[in-house]
Amino acid sequence: ARNGDHCPLGPGRCCRLHTVRASLEDLGWADWVLSPREVQVTMCIGACPSQFRAANMHAQIKTSLHRLKPDTVPAPCCVPASYNPMVLIQKTDTGVSLQTYDDLLAKDCHCI
Amino acid sequence: ARNGDHCPLGPGRCCRLHTVRASLEDLGWADWVLSPREVQVTMCIGACPSQFRAANMHAQIKTSLHRLKPDTVPAPCCVPASYNPMVLIQKTDTGVSLQTYDDLLAKDCHCI
């Protein structure tokens, strides 16, 4: 159950999808990826205030316990709820091949 | 691909399963849950240093970009990789029922 999408901290401050441009060198991929030379990495960044985009029951519990014991229990964290596939042309044991990665680019975010 | 399980920060400092004892009042459940009166909540807590229990390619990217742009990209976060089911005896519109929740107690943790 995804809870509220209204961010009480102000526009853009809560958990949402961001795009970060990164080179192969930035990613440490220069020695095994041929293409693309640059990746638009979509990732989940932002705060997870009470019940904001709570992914499930566990996230709701975490929010309650964080309120009670903030030094022991961290607030929920903004992570991918789903991914978009990405194709890389990469070096492999048997030459160069096209590989699809299903867990590389975040598509949607939630708090957990 | 789950990466290294060795914590460079010292024993117990990295992402792992913790148990937090919580009453129904703590969880805000006192008005709709009859049993159990207390829950041993298992949750994922701890740091996610470079490549520690990296859940997938996205987590590896996040580590690389956090190292480069720590103010923009947060470090990976310790979250459940899987859950244990939990049965609650709860009040419903038509009386009392037994409900199984599949997303309440963390079973295993990883960094993402």
Partner: antibody, heavy 112, light 107 residues
Framework: QVQLQQSGAELVKPGASVKLSCKAS????????INWVRQRPEQGLEWIGW????????KYNEKFKDKATLTTDTSSSTAYMQLIRLTSEDSAVYFC?????WGQGTTLTVSS | DNKMTQSPSSMYASLGERVTITCKAS??????LSWFQQKPGKSPKTLIY???KLVDGVPSRFSGSGSGQDYSLTISSLEYEDMGIYHC?????????FGGGTKLEIK
């Protein structure tokens, strides 16, 4: 099974051009690279160049960059190598290959 | 370019003998090295890839080893059908480069 079927022997006159073909089967043509290799009589193997059918990118041995042009036709899963301004020095057997698989070779004879 | 120096350029060996051929790269090739066997008038046949992985269907008497710049192909017990020319290829960086070849003949 993977097969690379090359076109038949060619006899051409000096100064002419020729286009050799390599038809791939048994795998997804656009997902793997193809190399072209030359073997002159009683000599070793020389790497001419590389093409990735997925995006058409190419790499050439500096020695052959003004001699060879690599292309592909993805609709027929065929790789081509065009050789221009032929001289007797270009008489050789030409192979298309992946790291694990080799075509049977095409014999090119340049003679007036 | 990464130059591949293969040795010996030719050799004679007896049936049942252990044979080793080496390839040295001028720079580290991260184990991106393959070995081929070629018989007269035939196309090369890949034996080993990524320095030490045996191609399916290739007899287990063939093995590859090495890392960094130095690699070797070993035939544990030479058989008659093993005579031919052996080539190495580095496919770590473009341009890919071949060794000069080793002609193996039976004594």
């Amino acid at each position: 099974q993977v097969q690379l079927q090359q076109s038949g022997a060619e006899l051409v006159k000096p100064g002419a051009s020729v286009k050799l073909s390599c038809k791939a089967s048994g795998y997804t043509f656009t997902n793997y690279d193809i190399n072209w290799v030359r073997q002159r009589p009683e000599q070793g193997l020389e790497w001419i160049g590389w093409i990735f059918p997925g995006d058409g990118s190419t790499k050439y041995n500096e020695k052959f960059k003004d001699k060879a042009t690599l292309t592909t036709d993805t609709s027929s899963s065929t790789a081509y190598m065009q050789l221009i301004r032929l001289t007797s020095e270009d008489s050789a057997v030409y192979f298309c290959a992946r790291i694990l698989y080799w075509g049977q070779g095409t014999t090119l004879t340049v003679s007036s | 370019d990464n130059k591949m120096t293969q040795s010996p350029s030719s050799m004679y060996a007896s049936l049942g003998e252990r044979v080793t051929i080496t390839c040295k790269a001028s720079q580290d090739i991260n184990s991106y090295l393959s070995w081929f066997q070629q018989k007269p008038g035939k196309s090369p046949k890949t034996l080993i890839y990524r320095a030490n992985k045996l191609v399916d269907g290739v007899p287990s008497r063939f093995s590859g080893s090495g890392s960094g710049q130095d690699y070797s192909l070993t035939i544990s017990s030479l058989e008659y059908e093993d005579m031919g020319i052996y080539h190495c290829l580095q496919y770590d960086e473009f341009p890919y480069t071949f060794g000069g070849g080793t002609k193996l003949e039976i004594k």
